[in-house]
Interface confidence: low
C-alpha cells in the first residue's frame, strides 16, 4: 500500500501521527475496535512531549489511551514496550482496585483530569483518543 | 454554562455536624474529580477533600480526616460534604471546585461554628 | 507535604505595570502548578493551569512559566479588574496545598 502523506479529515497532525478526539465516550474495548477499524490505534504516549499535546487537546476529562493489563503485564497496544518507555502515572496507581463493586479489577489506562494516568474498570465510557503515523502504509490500494 | 451551587452552610454548634451539598450543571459531571475548599475569614484557600469521577478515589487533608466525609450522586450531578464533630477552626467559607484543576468553582456557602 | 510559599506577600502597583508574582515549592512538582485570582467577597478564578496554560477566557496579558520548584505570574500591563489576591496551587500529590497570596493593591 501507500504511505499515507497527510492526516484525514478531522485529524490533527503532530510530530509525524495523526491524532482523533473523540467527543463522546466509549468502553475502552469499544474505543479499540473504532480506532482499528480507522486504520489506528489507541493513543500511545512516548514521551512527555506527546503527553502535553495530547493533554491539551482532551483538556481535563477522563480519556482513554491504548494501555491496558487485561492479559497480565502492562501493553501498549502498538507493542511499544512498556517496562522501558514513558510512563505517567498519579500517585499510588495503577492500583488494580477491587472495590467498585463492578466486578474484577482495573484493567485500562486513562488520562485523568489533570492528564496523569489512572487505572479504571474498562466497561466505563470515557472519551477516547485515536492515533496513527503517517509514515504507516495505508491500507488504501495504490494509485496506477 | 457550567455552574457549581452550594449549599447547607449555616450556623452550628462545637461538636455539631452539617451537610453540605453541590447542585453542577452545564458539563459531564461523571467525568470529572470534585473537591471541596475552603476559606477562613480573613484566611487563605485552603483544600479539604477531593473525589474521582467515579467515586473510587477519595482524599481529605489531615485537619478535617475522621470527620468530614465526601460523597458523590452521579445520577444527580450532586457532590456532598458531611461534616461532624465540627470545631471553631472549621469556621470558613466552603467552595466546590472542579477536577484536579480547580477550572470552575461555585460561589461557596458559609459554615460558622460558634457556640 | 508540599508547602507552597509565595512572594511578595503584598504589592502596591499603578494601571499599566507590569507585575510578578513568585511561587516557590518545598520539592519538585514538575508542572502541575496553577495559578487562581481572587477579589473579596467573590469565588476564587482560575487563570493558569500546567504552570503555562492559560484557561479559557483569560486575557492574555496575563503569563506563567516554570516547572520543578520555581514558577513565576507575569501581568505585562496590570487593569484596574487585575487588583485582587492571587494564589498558587500544588496538585502533583495529596493533600493539595496552596500559597499564602499575594495581594496586588493600588500605588
Known amino acids: 500500500g501507500s504511505e499515507r502523506t497527510c492526516c484525514p479529515v478531522n485529524w490533527v497532525e503532530h510530530e509525524r501521527s495523526c491524532y482523533w478526539f473523540s467527543r463522546s465516550g466509549k468502553a475502552w474495548a469499544d474505543a479499540d475496535n473504532y480506532c482499528r477499524l480507522e486504520d489506528a490505534h489507541l493513543v500511545v504516549v512516548t514521551s512527555w512531549e506527546e503527553q502535553k499535546f495530547v493533554q491539551h487537546h482532551i483538556g481535563p476529562v477522563n480519556t482513554w489511551m491504548g494501555l491496558h493489563d487485561q492479559n497480565g503485564p502492562w501493553k501498549w497496544v502498538d507493542g511499544t514496550d512498556y517496562e522501558t518507555g514513558f510512563k505517567n502515572w498519579r500517585p499510588e496507581q495503577p492500583d488494580d482496585w477491587y472495590g467498585h463493586g463492578l466486578g474484577g479489577g482495573e484493567d485500562c489506562a486513562h488520562f485523568t483530569d489533570d492528564g496523569r494516568w489512572n487505572d479504571d474498570v474498562c466497561q466505563r465510557p470515557y472519551r477516547w483518543v485515536c492515533e496513527t503515523e503517517l509514515d504507516k502504509a495505508s491500507q488504501e490500494p495504490p494509485l496506477l | 454554562e457550567v455552574q457549581l451551587v452550594e449549599s447547607g452552610g449555616g450556623l452550628v454548634k462545637p461538636g455539631g455536624s452539617l451537610r453540605l451539598s453541590c447542585a453542577a450543571s452545564g458539563f459531564t459531571f461523571n467525568s470529572y474529580s470534585m473537591n471541596w475548599v475552603r476559606q477562613a475569614p480573613g484566611k487563605g484557600l485552603e483544600w479539604v477533600s477531593s473525589?474521582?469521577?467515579?467515586?473510587?478515589?477519595?482524599y481529605y487533608a489531615d485537619s478535617v480526616k475522621g470527620r468530614f466525609t465526601i460523597s458523590r450522586d452521579n445520577a444527580k450531578n450532586s457532590l456532598y460534604l458531611q461534616m461532624h464533630s465540627l470545631r471553631a477552626e472549621d469556621t470558613a467559607v466552603y467552595y466546590c471546585a472542579r477536577s484536579n484543576l480547580f477550572d470552575c468553582w461555585g460561589q461557596g456557602t458559609p459554615v460558622t461554628v460558634s457556640s | 507535604d508540599i508547602q507552597m510559599t509565595q512572594s511578595p506577600s503584598s504589592l502596591s502597583a499603578s494601571v499599566g505595570d507590569r507585575v510578578t508574582i513568585t511561587c516557590r515549592a518545598s520539592?519538585?512538582?514538575?508542572?502541575?502548578l496553577a495559578w487562581f485570582q481572587q477579589t473579596p467577597g467573590k469565588a476564587p478564578k482560575s487563570l493558569i493551569s500546567v504552570a503555562s496554560s492559560l484557561q479559557s477566557g483569560v486575557p492574555s496579558r496575563f503569563s506563567a512559566s516554570g516547572s520543578g520548584t520555581d514558577f513565576t505570574l507575569t501581568i505585562s500591563s496590570l487593569q484596574p479588574e487585575d487588583f485582587a489576591t492571587y494564589y498558587c496551587?500544588?496538585?502533583?500529590?495529596?493533600?493539595?496545598?496552596f500559597g499564602p497570596g499575594t495581594k496586588v493593591d493600588i500605588k
Open positions: 473525589i474521582s469521577s467515579s467515586g473510587s478515589y477519595i
Open positions: 520539592q519538585g512538582i514538575s508542572n502541575y
Open positions: 496551587r500544588q496538585y502533583h500529590s495529596y493533600p493539595f496545598t
